[in-house]
């Protein structure tokens, strides 16, 4: 092909020419190309108008092309270019007009390019620039040059992993001249040991990230005090997993934050084994969002009921026991992948609407009632990937629930009463792989609004699917895969007029019957793959609903013998519905094993067996 040795990803639009030992820009790529990846080619030098042949380019990746020199007007023809990636080029000579002509550039990535200063970086004319990434360079001064006042659209400035040690008042002078309240600034992994008090006074930022910046606690404290006067929407402090410098916090570690205006706060990778952490977070009592990620903490019972947090996130943390959370204003709680607390204990969160308690290995002595969470406003509840959850209440006081996820937790007492009876607003329910054995036809009673029901990986009494869906008149998606099912009631699906997707795969059905699907006028997808279907269980195979668009019968045990001729012919008649038809193979007789069912010539001159 004309574009070879490059790879055509999207014809005329996207080409990948990665690591092809090109010394120059290829000339066999279509004029209309919008995305071009030239990374890992030894281009070394970019002269003027290097990309004249690609006026439509929007994304250009020149990572690790050994580029040392970029001449004036190298990108001159690229008026549509929005993203330019120069990562890992040992640039020694950058002409003043190197980036001229880039009138639409929004993202410039100059990571690891030997950049020693922002002052000499010729980007002052790039008025459309939204994101500038100059991480992993040799920048020592945080002084933002005067030309930054032209970059009025700048939203992200990544200066992480540079050599910045000191931040002075004069460094941020330009920010006072421009209303850049949308700017997110990442200074992580710079060896900061001094921030001049007042440097950030009356500065507004969208986000400030300071991770693994400080060699010790005292430096951190004084630097935080140096941030006084800053107004920041989101502040991220802490360290990285593999870059740990700080010993254990003391209660005054974050005192300086009292002099900042913060909307959202996140702390990452730290150890806070304090007896009483209320002192540590007192200055953060009024933030709207509070997040601890990978923090080792003794206990959080000391959060005050009066803290005004609306969103609390505790992820991958270590606790001595499940925290007693009592917070008046909290609307969202994400408590996931934590270690230490094995048993859930009730929380008092009267404003809570969203609760994610997934992946903690928690056991619940009872579930579920408003008294567990202290709220009647809950709409979203995720208890997936936990331990034993004993269903001892039918969601009394939690009638507002719309989303409920128990997947891969061990549900007990599911077949003793109609657990979900009061959940008339529930739209989504996942009880997949919950060790549920359905032995009670009223298991789903009350779920009048349910649209999605996932119950894969469970089991049924006598491996028979009874009429358990009678209330689910709004159901559109039903997953019954991996349930060891062998038979189903002919009327099991009779009330599911809105059902669009039905997954019956990975069960133990030996025959196919179209009768149970006659009352499914909206059915579009029916998956019967990975069963043991040999034939139909009656000679009169009716048609599936006319709405059906995809029928998956792959990986079954088709009996390609004369006695099943009508069934095999019926399968052929459904050809336009079949998904991956080539994977539908004969299992018997042995001489036809592995043959595609659709390629059989069914004339009953087949060997009678």
């Amino acid at each position: 092909e004309s574009w070879e040795p490059c790879v055509e990803v999207v014809p005329n639009i996207t080409y990948q020419c990665m690591e092809l030992k090109f010394y120059k820009i290829p000339d066999n790529i279509p004029f209309s190309t919008k995305n071009l990846d030239l990374s890992f080619n030894p281009l070394r030098h970019l002269g003027s108008y290097s990309f004249l042949r690609f006026p439509e380019l929007q994304v250009l990746d020149l990572s690790r092309c050994e580029i040392q020199t970029i001449e004036d007007g190298a990108y001159q023809s690229l008026s549509h270019l929005s993203t330019l990636i120069l990562t890992g080029n040992p640039i020694q000579s950058l002409a003043l007009g190197a980036f001229s002509g880039l009138s639409s550039l929004q993202k410039l990535v100059a990571v690891e390019t030997n950049l020693a200063s922002l002052e000499n970086f010729p980007i002052g004319h790039l008025k459309t620039l939204k994101e500038l990434n100059v991480a992993h360079n040799l920048i020592q001064s945080f002084k933002l040059p005067e030309y930054f006042s032209n970059l009025t659209n700048l939203e992200h400035l990544d200066l992480s992993s540079n050599k910045i040690q000191n931040i002075y008042c004069k460094d941020l002078q330009v920010l006072h001249q421009m209303p850049l309240s949308n700017l997110s600034l990442d200074l992580s992994l710079n060896p900061i040991n001094f921030i001049q008090p007042g440097a950030f006074k009356e500065i507004r930022l969208h986000k400030l990230t300071l991770r693994s910046n400080f060699d010790d606690l005292n430096v951190m404290k004084t630097c935080i005090q140096g941030l006084a006067g800053l107004e920041v929407h989101r502040l991220v402090l802490g360290e990285f997993r593999n870059e740990r410098n700080l010993e254990e916090f003391d209660k005054s570690s974050l005192e300086g934050l009292c002099n900042l205006t913060i909307e959202e706060f996140r702390l990452t990778y730290l150890d806070c084994y304090l007896d009483n952490i209320i002192d540590l977070f007192n200055c953060l009592a009024n933030v709207s969002s509070f997040s601890l990620v990978s923090v080792n903490i003794k206990r959080v019972e000391d959060f005050s009921y009066n803290f005004r947090w609306q969103h609390l996130e505790l992820v991958n943390c270590k606790f001595e026991q499940f925290p007693t959370l009592e917070l008046k204003s909290l609307k969202r709680l994400t408590f996931t992948a934590n270690k230490g607390g094995n048993a859930f204990s009730e929380v008092d969160l009267p404003s809570l609407e969203f609760l994610d308690l997934s992946r903690n290995g928690l056991s619940f002595k009872g579930c579920c009632s408003q008294s567990d969470f202290g709220t009647t406003s809950l709409k979203y509840l995720d208890l997936s990937f936990n331990d034993v959850i004993t269903m001892s209440s039918n969601f009394l006081g939690l009638e507002q629930l719309e989303h409920l996820d128990f997947q891969h937790s061990n549900l007990k007492q599911m077949s003793q009463f109609s657990v979900f009876l009061s959940l008339r607003n529930l739209i989504y329910l996942d009880i997949s792989h919950t060790h549920t054995r359905v032995a009670f036809n009223g298991i789903f009673d009350g779920l009048l609004s349910l649209k999605v029901l996932k119950m894969a990986g469970n089991s049924f009494q006598e491996n028979f699917l009874p009429d358990i869906f009678t209330d689910l008149k709004n159901l559109t998606f039903l997953d019954l895969s991996q349930c060891q099912l062998e038979q189903l009631s002919p009327t099991a699906f009779d009330t599911l007029n809105k059902l669009q997707v039905l997954n019956m795969s990975h069960n133990n059905f030996f025959s196919l019957d179209t009768f149970p699907y006659k009352c499914l006028p909206s059915l579009q997808v029916l998956d019967y793959s990975l069963n043991h279907i040999m034939t139909s269980n009656n000679q009169e195979l009716q048609h599936f609903p006319s709405s059906l668009a995809f029928l998956n019968l792959t990986q079954n045990d088709f009996a390609c013998t004369c006695e099943h001729q009508s069934f095999l012919q019926w399968i052929k008649d459904q050809r336009q519905l079949l998904v991956e038809a080539e994977r539908m193979e004969c299992a018997t007789p042995s001489d036809k094993q592995g043959m595609p069912v659709l390629s059989l010539n069914i004339t009953c001159q087949m060997n009678k067996t």
Epitope: D302, S304, K365, G366, N394, L396
Partner: antibody
Framework: QVQLQESGPGLVKPSDTLSLTCAVS?????????WHWIRQPPGKGLEWMGY???????DFNPSLKTRITISRDTSKNQFSLKLSSVTAVDTAVYYC???????????WGQGTLVTVSS | EIVLTQSPDFQSVTPKEKVTITCRAS??????LHWYQQKPDQSPKLLIK???HAISGVPSRFSGSGSGTDFTLTINSLEAEDAATYYC?????????FGGGTKVEIK
């Protein structure tokens, strides 16, 4: 409105077992919350004794652990206290109460006085 | 267990006067402290939860404050119907414990 009502004998002999029942109306005890016993010796302060959670789980004050049992009958919507080997110091007004999600008690029974005496 | 010490044990106050009752915890309990009023031959009644949050229906003259180990219940302008014993209770950890009580008498 949730209402709680204690009942049981007002006089128990030393070394016997004290048995009280709390009848709950206005809320099913299996539906949520935890259901507690608290006592108050005459002229003294309040002592928390233990509870039964709506799931049937129980927990007790360590000072009473060896003598106390709390059970329930969901069909009658009531829960019960048994305190064995009683002595005169167990003479008190016994209250049943419902604890809210926070560890406080908005609903109490009116209390019943139990005297331990021969 | 957490020990709650109330003071004073007894207070005799004239109507319209301000009453202050303190409760001290043996360890920090954040604001997980609740106040009850108990009148003779009645069961306790919840007044304040979480140190400072008045329960609906409770007169506004009752207020609470404090955090950590030191807490205060204030009755701003005492009325005759306020004659009762007042108890603090910690909800920070089990076993739940109560203060010894403060009896408020009308002069």
């Amino acid at each position: 409105q949730v209402q709680l009502q204690e009942s049981g004998p007002g006089l128990v002999k030393p070394s016997d077992t004290l048995s009280l029942t709390c009848a709950v109306s206005g809320y099913p005890i299996w539906g949520g919350y935890s259901w507690h016993w608290i006592r108050q010796p005459p002229g003294k302060g309040l002592e928390w004794m233990g509870y039964i959670h709506y799931s049937g789980y129980t927990d007790f004050n360590p000072s009473l652990k060896t003598r106390i049992t709390i059970s329930r009958d969901t069909s009658k919507n009531q829960f019960s206290l048994k305190l064995s080997s009683v002595t005169a110091v167990d003479t008190a007004v016994y209250y049943c109460a419902r604890k809210d999600s926070g560890n406080y008690f908005p609903y109490w029974g009116q209390g019943t006085l139990v005297t331990v005496s021969s | 267990e957490i020990v709650l010490t109330q003071s004073p044990d007894f207070q005799s106050v004239t109507p319209k006067e301000k009453v202050t009752i303190t409760c001290r915890a043996s360890q920090s309990i954040s604001d997980h402290l609740h106040w009850y009023q108990q009148k003779p031959d009645q069961s306790p009644k919840l007044l304040i939860k979480y140190a400072s949050h008045a329960i609906s229906g409770v007169p506004s003259r009752f207020s609470g404050s404090g955090s950590g180990t030191d807490f205060t219940l204030t009755i701003n302008s005492l009325e005759a119907e306020d004659a009762a014993t007042y108890y603090c209770q910690q909800g920070h950890s089990f076993p739940l414990t109560f203060g010894g009580g403060t009896k408020v008498e009308i002069k």
